[in-house]
């Protein structure tokens, strides 16, 4: 069927439209276009005779129309009056006629709109504002944008007049925004410049800063007032009801107690005609005294006594502050503050609670600090230590032992040999010792203030012969490539040389081996399974030498990547499958099998009798070492062929 398609359907003024003909019959004599929905000679636009390829204009021709050989009609430089229907009249060679009608609509290219307003300075919570989008255009859609976003949903926003007018009821300061309108029709869209709504508001209740109301005599009083307002507010100050000045700030230098009173800030908005006031009460104090700290216990005993520190003097309506070691109080269950913060209690004092302690009195703008106080905490004595640490001496040398125990006041020391008091000194000196000087040497430390005593006993051996040494280790089961091991040769002896052997040979040169502590300690870094050897230490002096029993290092390692044997992967149907898995590991690993991902048995050997092609698949051996926490696995593919068709070797039972 003959049809007309308009391209485009909606046309902008000044542009072109093509009335495209579809399903044009064959064997045509010619055709003619008419304005309107019917054939009317007075409204003929143009005709076309196919034989002569000649176009002929009609009464409705405007000079803007062009007809094509395929009967399509182009109209250029479109005007508003072109809107409507167009009829194509087709004359066939047999002089039978056919008609089709098409249509299009013409729209103007829209001008840039602008916004008019009925109120340029609306007052908050009082006025309404109506914005109108100009000009009024037929067949145009109107849209509104606030801060480049579509209109928010609000009961105070109302669109009217075909959306051409936007009304804001009861404007607020938050309506101060950029407003734009947009006009749209099917062929164009234009947006206006933005209009900023200037809402008059305020003043709100003013705020006076700073907030503090207490001052010391001699300070400067500097108050500032601010109230949200458009246009900005005008400010006035009143002291005890008497007008002072019309400024935003009030400054009074070198105030006295007489400046105490009520200070009022008044904010005024000349456009809204509104006034708001805020009152603050200022109190001026005379200079307070410097605080000081008193204590209920000047010599508390560690872990026994509590101490209460009090900040003096007591002043009503005053904030008390505390500092320990020049820092604010740490959070601790042993520190307690009284309700007024004036007393700080230390429960069960320790030697670390010595301080210094400071308290302060806060006076609004500043803080007065006390002098620091240091606590004399009595503690100790702790277990004394005897030095040097040697236990073996050769005859003929001098024995010089020193004793020390942490204590306050400092400890008093006594020495005993085999339980017999020797002397009341910190050091014990015996010259030219012999075997008879061997025995138990006791140091006793006493704190006279706390009455506590502590002792330490040391065995001293005087002998020309060195004792048989022994090896101590800091790690009896190190993990390979992870741990280090430190061997120490015992005992510690004076003027003694320490030696080491590994598997009966002197130490190899290795960056992983390190001697320290006068060669008394041998450290193996990043141990490996090859370090699992016999270690012997020896001690020697100018008189004698001795060796320890060997110590064998038990290095935990693995599991390494397992090996499945036999290596064959092809089997004949009916054979027995006997796979064995092995992985180097210390201690021995746990084994488990999976066939095609399905767990089997937890054994080292996997046995399947009389296999068939159903036993084809992947055979995985999993190993795990519980001591090292490490795992490993290997996968092997097994192919079972029907008897006589095996591509490879067969493995029997």
């Amino acid at each position: 069927k003959l049809t007309i398609e308009s391209t485009p359907f909606n046309v902008a003024e000044g542009k072109e439209v093509l009335l495209l003909v579809h399903n044009l019959p064959q064997h045509l004599f010619g055709y003619s276009w008419y304005k309107g929905e019917r054939v009317d000679g007075n409204r003929q636009i143009i005709g076309y005779v196919i034989g002569t390829q000649q176009a002929t204009p009609g009464p409705a021709y405007s000079g803007r129309e062009i007809i094509y050989p395929n009967a399509s009609l182009l109209i250029q430089n479109i005007i508003q009056n072109d809107t409507g229907f167009y009829t194509l009249h087709v004359i066939k060679s047999d002089l039978v006629n056919e008609e089709a009608t098409g249509q299009f609509r013409v729209y103007p290219e829209l001008p840039k709109p602008s916004i008019s307003s009925n109120n340029s300075k609306p007052v908050e919570d009082k006025d309404a504002v109506a914005f109108t989008c100009e000009p009024e255009t037929q067949d145009a859609t109107y849209l509104w944008w606030v801060n480049n976003q579509s209109l928010p949903v609000s009961p105070r926003l109302q669109l009217s007049n075909g959306n051409r007018t936007l009304t804001l009821f009861n404007v607020t300061r938050n309506d101060t925004a950029s407003y734009k309108c947009e006009t749209q029709n099917p062929v164009s869209a234009r947006r206006s410049d933005s209009v900023i709504l200037n809402v008059l508001y305020g003043p709100d209740a003013p705020t006076i800063s700073p907030l503090n109301t207490s001052y010391r005599s001699g300070e400067n009083l500097n108050l500032s007032c601010h109230a949200a307002s458009n246009p900005p507010a005008q400010y006035s100050w009143f002291v005890n009801g008497t007008f002072q000045q019309s400024t935003q700030e009030l400054f009074i230098p070198n105030i006295t107690v007489n400046n105490s009173g009520s200070y009022t800030c008044q904010a005024h908005n000349s456009d809204t005609g509104l006034n708001r006031t805020t009152v603050t009460t200022i109190t001026v104090y005379a200079e307070p005294p410097k605080p000081f700290i008193t204590s209920n216990n000047s010599n508390p005993v560690e872990d026994e006594d509590a101490v209460a520190l009090t900040c003096e003097p007591e002043i009503q309506n005053t904030t008390y502050l505390w500092w320990v070691n020049n820092q604010s109080l740490p959070v601790s269950p042993r520190l307690q503050l009284s309700n007024d913060n004036r007393t700080l209690t230390l429960l069960s004092v320790t030697r670390n609670d010595v301080g210094p302690y400071e308290c302060g009195i806060q006076n609004e703008l500043s803080v007065d600090h006390s002098d620091p106080v240091i606590l004399n905490v009595l503690y100790g004595p702790d277990d004394p230590t005897i030095s040097p640490s040697y236990t073996y001496y050769r005859p003929g040398v001098n024995l010089s032992l020193s004793c020390h125990a942490a204590s306050n006041p400092p400890a008093q020391y006594s020495w005993l040999i085999d339980g017999n008091i020797q002397q009341h000194t910190q050091e014990l000196f015996i010259s030219n010792i012999t075997e008879k000087n061997s025995g138990l040497y006791t140091c006793q430390a006493n704190n006279s203030a706390s009455g506590h005593s502590r002792t330490t006993v040391k065995t001293i051996t005087v002998s020309a012969e060195l004792p048989k040494p022994s090896i101590s280790s800091n790690n009896s089961k190190p993990v390979e490539d992870k741990d280090a091991v430190a061997f120490t040769c015992e005992p510690e002896a004076q003027n003694t040389t320490y030696l080491w052997w590994v598997n009966g040979q002197s130490l190899p040169v290795s960056p992983r081996l390190q001697l320290s502590n006068g060669n008394r300690t041998l450290t193996l870094f990043n141990v490996t399974r090859n370090d699992a050897r016999a270690y012997v230490c020896g001690i020697q002096n100018s008189v004698s030498a001795n060796r320890s029993d060997p110590v064998t290092l038990d290095v935990l390692y693995g599991p390494d990547t397992p090996i499945i044997s036999p290596p064959d992967s092809s089997y004949l149907s009916g054979a027995n499958l006997n796979l064995s898995c092995h992985s180097a590991s210390n201690p021995s690993p746990q084994y488990s099998w999976r066939i095609n991902g399905i767990p089997q048995q937890h054994t080292q050997v996997l046995f399947i009798a009389k296999i068939t092609p159903n036993n084809n698949g992947t055979y995985a051996c999993f190993v795990s070492n519980l001591a090292t926490g490490r795992n490993n696995s290997i996968v092997k593919s097994i192919t079972v062929s029907a008897s006589g068709t095996s591509p490879g070797l067969s493995a029997g039972a």
Partner: nanobody, 119 residues
Framework: EVQLVESGGGLVQPGGSLRLSCAAS????????IGWVRRAPGKEEELVAA????????RYADSVKGRFTISADTSKNTAYLQMNSLRAEDTAVYYC????????????WGQGTTVTVSS
């Protein structure tokens, strides 16, 4: 009545000049595009120049660029084709046409005017 009437043709020597006129009636040339089309025996029909007065644009065939100038006088509703440096190959019947700059097509129905370039 809608009409396009061409005039100004004639015999001219090579290198000479002619000015063709196209008088339109029944519509305003300021609303549309006017083109000059030439037909010569044994040659393909050729659009040589066109002017869209409402757009203020002109176009020329490569063969006449720099030699021919198209213009329009909207007060007289007439279009003109000034032809300079004429060559023998410019010999043809010149028709005034309604031209579509958009689809590069035209309709014409005037009688045409003959231009002969010969020594």
């Amino acid at each position: 009545e809608v009409q396009l009437v061409e005039s100004g043709g004639g015999l001219v020597q090579p290198g000479g000049s002619l000015r063709l006129s196209c008088a339109a009636s029944g519509f305003n040339i300021k609303d549309t595009c006017i083109g000059w089309v030439r037909r010569a025996p044994g040659k393909e029909e050729e659009l040589v120049a066109a002017i869209c007065t409402y757009k203020g644009t002109t176009r020329y065939a490569d063969s006449v660029k720099g030699r021919f100038t198209i213009s329009a006088d909207t007060s007289k509703n007439t279009a003109y084709l000034q032809m300079n440096s004429l060559r023998a190959e410019d010999t043809a019947v010149y028709y005034c046409a309604i031209y579509s700059h958009y689809y590069d097509y035209y309709n014409y129905w005037g009688q045409g005017t003959t231009v002969t370039v010969s020594s």
